[in-house]
Interface confidence: low
């Protein structure tokens, strides 16, 4: 799933200021193609630990075998542990299950740094609070891996949520939730709203826990505020988008958008960092130090090596510029705007000796496959997955960080015109070339 | 670090009323869950109501509903539970938690990372 493991470092931490609101309604009619409203029964459903992903409880097999699994965008397989290892508390046991069945096929996945291999075969898959339904599902049992699970972060498997085309060994091995949406009445819908701890923690294990929110079929209102706002997934591979213009602090990178797509933008719950293509990150770094040069910053802390940090308390949010993402709207030469904070791009780092002080990572970083909305965009939106109507939805998480002077914002529409210039076209040859 | 104080305990007559306070302080930009709990002597910590800030949505416990309200005052970053029809099973020491977690288990201990010193709450009859 793209190059190099995409697993999140950390989540973040999440939240929305104490204040006196009126409740929201959260009983509206239906509304096709994905029930809205409230999903009591599906909230707060993500788990996770500082850094470590977010997963949901899963069930597989005859009885049910409980297992927490990593929700990812960015790939298609679901694909568990089956077999002991180190890192894993409880893997999956086929043989223990009356429903499994073998589809004598081997799948291989390499990583730049990493792999995993296993056994394909298929069997019942429940989401406990989820939708009360079982599907026959695939399933890549694990039998070999390296550098793919991480000690102690409470997840056995990954579920790719994206679409066949990016599924191995090939297109024909149907994800998750193609078959959920084939076998049940699951509108083709699902919503992500991924928070942090809520705090600056760094006391414990416990403290650092994460969670979100995975609405599978719908939406659900309370868990954003303000309008959602769609942009097309250009196609259906990853979850691709079409990025048409960034502002640091409102002022425009102006470069040429294809710059900003290139090779393409994606939506992936599974990578921690804002990841830009190389001319595009340089160019934000540079207008990143400018606004923030009141403080200096050493280069290994643009290159998200080193860390910065302050007493505690102090961290000088302000100085920081806020960032602008225009995405190509459904109205021919309209788009619009997501805007994230510098809560959402320092990520704060947990593990450090001087526990008196808040120290923090810069969350966005180059890439050579194009741009990556990870976590540091997805905290600070609701996002719905609309594949019914083949689009992306995009609102202010109600959970995320923020302080007393700014907040993330989701604006429009804007007048942007050729937008359809702003998508790279990639070569039809090297795509089977890719290295996940 | 969240600080997180409580007042208003104190004991009362059977049918009567109490008005608990917590007041929050510290670093509250980020709380979004804020819930009252309550451990009666030889008995474990139970949930009793909790509120939602960014929608205002509130949830009670069963033994509680209709009886007590839980409510916030931004401006003095302050949580409310308004007891009213107290009856001598509510005496307890209640205690004021704030969170990061979401709805489901608004009133579970379990993910709480900020807890008042409590505040003793008496019934009689």
């Known amino acids: 799933t793209q190059h190099g493991i995409r697993l999140p470092l950390r989540s973040g931490l999440g939240g929305a200021p104490l204040g006196l609101r009126l409740p929201r309604e959260t009983d509206e009619e239906p509304e096709e193609p994905g029930r809205r409203g409230s999903f009591v029964e599906m909230v707060d459903n993500l788990r996770g630990k500082s850094g470590q992903g977010y997963y949901v409880e899963m069930t597989v097999g005859s009885p049910p075998q409980t297992l927490n699994i990593l929700v990812d965008t960015g790939s298609s397989n679901f694909a568990v542990g089956a077999a002991p290892h180190p890192f894993l508390h409880r893997y999956y046991q086929r043989q223990l299950s009356s429903t499994y069945r073998d589809l004598r096929k081997g799948v291989y996945v390499p990583y730049t740094q990493g792999k995993w291999e296993g056994e394909l075969g298929t069997d019942l898959v429940s989401i406990p609070h989820g939708p009360n339904v079982t599907v026959r599902a695939n399933i890549a049992a694990i039998t070999e891996s390296d550098k793919f699970f991480i000690n102690g972060s409470n997840w056995e498997g990954i579920l790719g949520l994206a679409y066949a085309e990016i599924a191995r060994p090939d297109d024909s091995l149907e994800p998750f939730f193609d078959s959920l949406v084939k076998q049940t009445h699951v509108p083709n819908l699902f919503s992500l709203q991924l928070c942090g701890a809520g705090f600056p923690l760094n006391q414990s294990e416990v403290l650092a826990s994460v969670g979100g929110s995975m609405i599978i079929g719908g939406i659900d209102h309370s868990l954003y505020t303000g309008s959602l706002w769609y942009t097309p997934i250009r196609r259906e591979w990853y979850y691709e988008v079409i990025i048409v213009r960034v502002e640091i602090n409102g002022q425009d990178l102006k470069m040429d958008c294809k710059e900003y797509n290139y090779d393409k933008s994606i939506v992936d719950s599974g990578t921690t960092n804002l990841r830009l293509p190389k001319k595009v990150f340089e160019a934000a770094v540079k207008s990143i130090k400018a606004a923030s040069s009141t403080e200096k910053f050493p280069d290994g802390f643009w290159l998200g090596e080193q860390l910065v940090c302050w007493q505690a308390g102090t961290t000088p949010w302000n100085i920081f510029p806020v960032i602008s993402l225009y995405l190509m709207g459904e109205v021919t030469n309209q788009s619009f705007r997501i805007t994230i904070l510098p809560q959402q791009y320092l990520r704060p780092v947990e593990d450090v000796a001087t526990s008196q002080d808040d120290c923090y990572k810069f969350a966005i970083s180059q890439s050579s496959t194009g741009t990556v909305m990870g976590a540091v965009i997805m905290e600070g939106f609701y996002v719905v997955f609309d594949r019914a109507r083949k689009r992306i939805g995009f609102a202010v998480s109600a959970c995320h960080v923020h302080d007393e002077f700014r907040t993330a914002a989701v604006e429009g529409p804007f007048v942007t015109l050729d937008m359809e210039d702003c998508g790279y076209n990639i070569p039809q040859t090297d795509e089977s070339t890719l290295m996940t | 670090d969240v600080q997180l104080q409580e007042s208003g305990g104190g004991s009362v007559q059977a049918g009567g009323s109490l008005r608990l306070s917590c007041a929050v302080s510290g670093y509250t930009y980020n709380i979004y869950t804020m819930a009252w709990f309550r451990q009666a002597p030889g008995k474990e910590r139970e949930g009793v109501a909790g509120?939602?800030?960014?929608?205002?949505?509130?949830y009670y416990a069963d033994s509680v509903k209709g009886r007590f309200t839980i409510s916030q005052d931004n401006a003095k970053n302050t949580v409310y539970l308004q007891m009213n029809s107290l009856a001598p099973e509510d005496t307890a020491i209640y205690y004021c938690?704030?969170?990061?977690?979401?709805?489901?288990?608004?009133?579970?201990?379990?993910?709480?990372?900020?807890w008042g010193q409590g505040t003793q709450v008496t019934v009689s009859s």
């Open positions: 509120i939602y800030s960014p929608g205002g949505t509130t």
């Open positions: 938690a704030a969170r990061g977690g979401l709805l489901s288990r608004v009133l579970k201990e379990a993910g709480y990372n900020a």
